[in-house]
């Protein structure tokens, strides 16, 4: 009675294919012959187990790394199969916006590119999707803009997709950086005041960074001194009637505002007494 | 009635610092921005410091940036002038002002006098 | 920046009119200017703000004999009916903002002499 190690090892996939990622996959270890018998079968990279119903190994929720798997079967002896790859498929893995041009703070005006980036993929044809707000803007891998605009800013996101499924990007927030515009004197409480009271004059605008320095200005284009966004006359006289503007200015550059004109009108006692 | 009250000047070493004071009273202070201005022993006026109601702007001439720092505690309704490395030149009588409404200084302190000299 | 320029001083025989001169420099002659009064041994006193139309907003307690007036790059003091406590020098001043760093100037001041 010659005793030998199982002959003709040989590991079996009993799914389908293809295997997705998640699936649960069924392996058989086979053999042709053995003596004495087998008493137990190890799995790599999976471990031992003793009891020979073990032959079969179920593989829960595979993942996209399982990539080989070996079984042995063992009598007095192991002997092992070569290897199977499960070439398990999956959806795009780690996808993320990424800058790639300007290097440094984007600025109105500037061309941006911006490139979606994943790690792996299989199967490795991919189409991908570019969307800001809920609304598809491209394609293509590369999202460009040949002139950025403040309106341009805002979350971006890329999807990436392949035959198994789609996987998107953390939002990125595109950040715009430029000069104050739309600048405007508001006047409260109205543009109308009496001698004697208080009038706020208001510089409104829009800048990414903010306003860091304001400066006022009366219709000869004289600065006042003052370098607030509000500036309060309190009381305010009938001599101080005209128009007035201002200039904000941030890292970027400055902007203006249109004239604003106030206007200071004499109290019934002033009146009274000419 | 307002009221601008410098104090803290006197005799200092070239080289040396000094901080002069002003306190207001008859008015908001908080809401005012302030000036000090000096005045020469040639009687010339001299705009030497500006700071904003809240204190967050300040402005120097060049003949004092670096070397003059202006403040303010609008709690204590006042106004600080810290002085170094003072020369010569820096002699004069120190006038606190407050700022009018659009263009102008409307109302001057007494003064307090700084002599650089060794 | 701006720059003011003044006689250096004037004399007026008493219960005349005076009219003193602050003249701005070419580039700014639209700019609103600062009148101030320096009595022998005092501080200065705001006067009157002066606008280049001629309006103008006078200070606390300053008679009406003064009054202001403008041409051009020109802006004037006048005192009418001139007192002994007129006797001071006047001072003009203006201020501006260039590169983002405001600045305030004054012109040299006249010296205003009462006689009789």
């Known amino acids: 009675d010659v005793q030998y190690p199982p002959k003709k090892v040989t590991t079996v996939i009993q799914n389908p294919m293809p295997i997705r990622e998640g699936d649960t996959v069924t392996l058989s270890c086979n053999y042709n012959s053995s003596n004495p018998s087998v008493t137990r079968y190890e799995w790599k990279p999976h471990g031992a187990w003793e009891e020979p119903s073990l032959g079969v190994l179920k593989i829960q929720n595979v993942g996209w790394d399982n990539t080989t798997i070996a079984c042995a079967a063992c009598n007095s002896w192991c002997s092992w199969a070569s290897p199977v790859a499960l070439n398990v498929q999956y959806a795009p893995r780690d996808v993320r916006v990424r800058k790639i041009k300007p290097l440094s703070e984007i600025h109105s005006g500037n061309s941006v590119s911006l490139q979606c980036d994943f790690s792996s993929s299989h199967p490795k044809e991919v189409q991908f999707f570019w969307e800001k707000n809920g609304r598809l803007l491209g394609k293509e891998s590369q999202l460009n803009f040949d002139s950025i605009s403040p309106e341009d800013a805002g979350s971006y996101s890329c999807w990436v997709n392949n035959s198994i499924g789609q996987t998107a990007s953390k939002a990125w927030t595109l950040e715009v950086l430029y000069a104050p515009r739309r600048l405007r004197v508001s006047m409260s409480p109205g543009d109308q005041v009496m001698e004697g009271k208080s009038a706020t004059l208001t510089c409104e605008s829009d800048a990414n960074p903010p306003v860091s320095h304001y400066t006022w200005f009366d219709w000869n284009n004289q600065s006042l001194p003052y370098h607030s966004q509000k500036l309060r006359l309190e009381p305010v006289k009938v001599q101080h009637s005209g128009a007035y503007w201002c200039q904000g200015t941030n890292s970027v550059g400055k902007g203006r505002s249109p004239l604003s004109t106030l206007t200071v009108y004499y109290s019934p006692e002033t009146i009274g007494r000419r | 009635e307002v009221k601008l009250v410098e104090s803290g000047g006197g005799l200092v070493l070239p080289g040396g610092s000094l901080k002069i004071s002003c306190a207001a009273s008859?008015?908001?202070?908080?809401?005012?921005?302030m000036y000090w201005i000096r005045q020469t022993p040639d009687k010339r006026l001299e705009w030497v410091a500006y700071?904003?109601?809240?204190?967050?702007?300040?402005f120097y001439p060049d003949s004092v940036k670096g070397r003059f720092t202006v403040s303010r505690d609008n709690a204590k309704n006042t106004l600080y002038l810290q002085m170094s490395r003072l020369q010569s030149e820096d002699t004069a009588m120190y006038y606190c002002?407050?700022?009018?409404?659009?263009?102008?200084?409307?109302?001057w302190g007494q003064g307090t006098s700084v002599t650089v000299s060794s | 920046q701006p720059v003011l320029t003044q006689s250096s001083s004037a004399s007026f025989s008493l219960g005349a009119s005076a009219k003193l001169t602050c003249t701005l420099s070419?580039?700014?002659?639209?700019?609103?200017i600062g009148w101030y009064q320096q009595q022998p041994l005092k501080p200065p006193k705001y006067v009157m703000e002066?606008?280049?139309?001629?309006?103008?907003h006078t200070g606390d307690g300053i008679p009406d004999r003064f009054s202001g007036s403008s041409s051009g790059a020109d802006r004037y003091l006048s005192i009418s009916n001139i007192q002994p406590e007129d006797e001071a020098t006047y001072i003009c001043?203006?201020?501006?903002?260039?590169?983002?760093?405001?600045?305030?100037?004054f012109g040299g001041g006249t010296k205003v002499t009462v006689l009789g």
């Open positions: 002002a407050r700022h009018g409404i659009l263009y102008a200084m409307d109302y």
């Open positions: 008859g008015f908001t202070f908080s809401d005012y921005y």
């Open positions: 700071i904003s109601n809240t204190g967050y702007s300040t």
């Open positions: 070419s580039q700014y002659s639209t700019y609103t």
């Open positions: 002066l606008k280049h139309d001629g309006s103008r």
């Open positions: 001043g203006v201020g501006d903002t260039i590169k983002e760093q405001f600045m305030y100037v």
